[in-house]
Interface confidence: low
């Protein structure tokens, strides 16, 4: 139709200029479109350069939209992580503060001369919670062994207790149960509670990390072409008022985000496992009850040792022989005061319940994030047509869009009419992230069963640092405790000189 040749390019000029491009590129009136590489080759208001500029722009706009959606999800996960992390750390800090405030009065020198050992234990528990590759059972066993040696010496200042005698004491200890049931109870409960807390928080970290890394996956050239056709070809072909048909948009974005949709199954598994493990936050072996009450087990242990002192001493002498008397030493210590115990069951503050219920709701909301992404982006970012089916832009003209909507994921894109997808070449970054989701889900399932898991070597990029290695964001500001080579010397953290006065001030 010769009349169409003279159609003005005013609307395209307006849109093109608004994107920041030079208006000198835009023809005054439509020109023949044989030069077009992406848009249908009818009469057009777009030169080759304009088509290329708009293709690059549409690609960038989709990547921005994708990153924006990801950022919202990342922010939610980061907020959850911070809230839970703060709460769990607060519980442990509260327990340590209570210990520092009450043990000097309750146990006197039995505590003050060993304040470092207690502080080191809390340091180790913090490290363990934060994902350090510590074996909690061994850490606790070592703490009790050292504490027994030191307390036994303090309870018997009149005796000479050389290293070989203390080694013998250590060997007898398991059978004698000098601290009563406290070590066993603490070990069983603490392992379950800490592993549940740290795996849940780490799950949030891994989820956030996966979203961040996937958002950086570039969209391929075939996707760029399809998005250009979807968004700007209508303008080039002189139907600028026509908005994309909904099903057409979905097919384009399902093709573009085919690899991302393959995250769906493992993403759901991870979120399900995270929701499930929150069951372990309640009850007598629950996170709140245990982490906030470490000091009460320690108090029970010292009380038990004092109560059992005479029996223990007799059995140790029976098993290890009579130790030599220290001529310079004072007489045997008087029976020491019993430390008053705080109730072991902390009344729930309600904070954790609130955090968990919010987290469950939010995790459920984002379960279908990856497969709903094409639909979400189409409806929120692509200004879809709300007109009748035959009045929308179908990629060729204004009219009905006939092809069916493809399924989700890479394999289902084999016949996608809008984006040429090579289903034999999955994106490697996304495959790695699927692997990360699987690994974390397995950890959470192990944690649900109360099993400790190795939190090292989960990094997927081989760099040896970053948030894939079992640390909380950049809270990898931790290290495995410095154990000195001799089992007789105290744990040598470099902050051992916290005096009792300072210890009581900590808050």
């Amino acid at each position: 139709d010769p009349a169409s040749k003279s159609r003005s390019c005013g609307e395209v000029r307006q849109i093109y200029g608004a994107k920041g491009f030079s208006l000198s590129d835009v023809p005054q009136a439509e020109i023949s479109g044989e030069h077009l590489r992406i848009c249908p080759q009818g009469y057009t208001c777009c030169t080759s350069e304009m088509e290329e500029n708009l293709a690059n722009r549409s690609h960038a706009e989709l990547e921005t939209a994708l990153r924006d959606s990801s950022r919202v999800l990342q922010a939610m996960l980061a907020t959850q992580l911070r809230s839970f992390d703060d709460h769990f750390q607060h519980l442990l800090n509260d327990s340590e503060r209570t210990l520092q405030a009450t043990f000097p009065g309750a146990f006197g020198e039995l505590y003050t001369q060993n304040a470092r050992a207690f502080r080191d234990l809390y340091s180790e528990l913090r490290l363990y919670y934060r994902g350090a590759n510590l074996h909690l059972e061994e850490t606790l066993a070592e703490f009790w062994a050292r504490l027994l040696e030191r307390l036994f010496k303090q309870l018997h200042p009149q005796l000479l207790l050389p290293d070989d005698y203390l080694d013998c004491l250590g060997k007898q200890a398991e059978a004698l149960r000098p601290f009563g049931e406290a070590p066993r109870e603490l070990r069983l409960r603490a392992t379950r509670a800490f592993v549940a807390a740290r795996s849940f928080v780490q799950g949030l970290g891994v989820a956030s990390d996966v979203v961040r890394k996937v958002a950086q996956v570039p969209l391929g050239p075939e996707c760029s072409r399809a998005v250009m056709k979807l968004v700007y070809c209508a303008h080039c072909l002189g139907v600028p008022g026509a908005r994309p048909c909904p099903d057409y948009c979905r097919n384009v974005l399902k093709g573009c985000l085919a690899n991302q949709a393959d995250l769906d199954a493992e993403w759901r598994n991870l979120l399900d496992s995270m929701v499930l493990i929150t069951d372990k936050f309640w009850g007598t072996s629950g996170v709140e009850s245990v982490i906030g009450s470490v000091h009460t087990w320690l108090a029970e242990a010292i009380n038990a040792l004092q109560d059992n002192r005479d029996t223990l001493t007799a059995k140790v002498i029976q098993g290890c022989g009579n130790p030599k008397v220290n001529p310079q030493g004072p007489g045997p210590e008087e029976k020491r005061r019993r430390g008053k115990l705080a109730p072991r069951e902390r009344p729930p503050s309600g904070t954790l319940e609130k955090l968990v219920s919010e987290a469950k709701a939010q995790l459920r909301d984002v379960q279908d994030f990856w497969i709903s992404l094409p639909g979400t982006l189409c409806s929120e970012k692509m200004a879809l047509s709300t007109a009748s089916d035959d009045r929308c832009w179908n990629g060729m003209a204004r009219g009905r869009y006939l092809p069916e909507v493809m399924g989700d994921g890479l394999a289902n894109q084999i016949n996608n009419p809008e984006v040429e997808v090579d289903i034999t070449k999955p994106d490697m970054t996304i495959r790695q992230q699927i692997m990360q989701l699987k690994i974390m889900t397995n950890r959470l399932r192990s944690a649900y069963n109360g099993n400790d898991v190795d939190f090292q070597d989960a990094s997927d990029d081989g760099s040896g640092s970053g948030s894939g290695d079992g640390c909380l964001d950049d809270l990898c500001s931790r290290k495995v405790s410095r154990k000195s080579s001799s089992s007789r010397t105290p744990l040598t953290h470099a902050l051992p000189g916290l005096s009792e006065q300072e210890g009581q001030k900590t808050s």
Partner: antibody, heavy 123, light 104 residues
Framework: AVTLDESGGGLQTPGRALSLVCKAS????????MLWVRQAPGKGLEWVGV????????NYGAAVKGRATISRDNGQNTVRLQLNNLRAEDTATYYC?????????????????WGLGTEVIVS | ALTQPSSVSANPGETVKITCSGG????YGWYQQKSPGSALVTVI????KRPTDIPSRFSGSTSGSTGTLTITGVQAEDEAVYFC???????????FGAGTTLTV
């Protein structure tokens, strides 16, 4: 990049108090323990003290114990050293340092970054 | 204090080892200072960890209660005083060595 910027040095009067401030940037301040180290003219390094990441625990070297207080403001990314009852032997360049770790237990062997130092002369 | 040699000299390209002993926590850090009172740079912390901006020719190790700083293929710009830092459990204090002057 991690930067630590000390201020508050200069000429001080014996018997008075000194307050040095270290402003940190380029890292998540609240996650890391912070230390103060000093160097007297022509001498070696001397550990002054350390504060834990949360600010709840401190520890001091023998030469300043009882006179020094280290505090921190995690909102402002600052750590402060207050040294009372100044003596001539407190004359030194004072360095603020960041630990690579963030729990009660950081020592000088864990320092991974230093400030440029601020000179204090007690005379 | 920790014990370290007062001076060490080497030709460019040679390997230099500086030792530090006397710490009871078996943890050492190594710090470079090009002139007295000037900026300090950590070359090794926590025995063997190297800050990201430090060249790979610097490495650290610990054996028993002795820490060692190794500079493989020493360069002229490595000329400086190197202090080691560690911990003494008998005094509950963090301590430094007196410094080793490296001349290249």
């Amino acid at each position: 990049a991690v930067t630590l910027d000390e201020s508050g040095g200069g000429l001080q009067t014996p018997g008075r108090a000194l307050s040095l401030v270290c402003k940190a940037s380029g890292f998540t301040f609240s996650n890391y323990d912070m230390l103060w180290v000093r160097q007297a003219p022509g001498k070696g390094l001397e550990w002054v003290g350390v504060i834990s990441s949360s600010g709840s625990s401190t520890n001091y070297g023998a030469a300043v114990k009882g006179r020094a207080t280290i505090s921190r403001d995690n909102g402002q990314n600052t750590v402060r050293l207050q040294l009372n009852n100044l003596r001539a032997e407190d004359t030194a360049t004072y360095y603020c340092a960041k630990s690579a770790y963030g729990y009660y237990g950081s020592g000088v062997s864990d320092i991974d970054a230093w400030g440029l130092g601020t000179e204090v002369i007690v005379s | 204090a920790l014990t370290q040699p007062s001076s060490v000299s080497a030709n460019p390209g040679e390997t230099v080892k500086i030792t530090c002993s006397g710490g009871s926590g078996n943890n050492y850090g190594w710090y470079q200072q090009k002139s007295p009172g000037s900026a300090l740079v950590t070359v090794i912390y926590d025995n063997n960890k190297r800050p990201t901006d430090i060249p790979s020719r610097f490495s650290g190790s610990t054996s028993g209660s002795t820490g060692t700083l190794t500079i493989t293929g020493v360069q002229a710009e490595d000329e400086a005083v190197y202090f080691c830092g560690g911990y003494d459990s008998s005094t509950y204090a963090d301590i430094f060595g007196a410094g080793t002057t490296l001349t290249v």
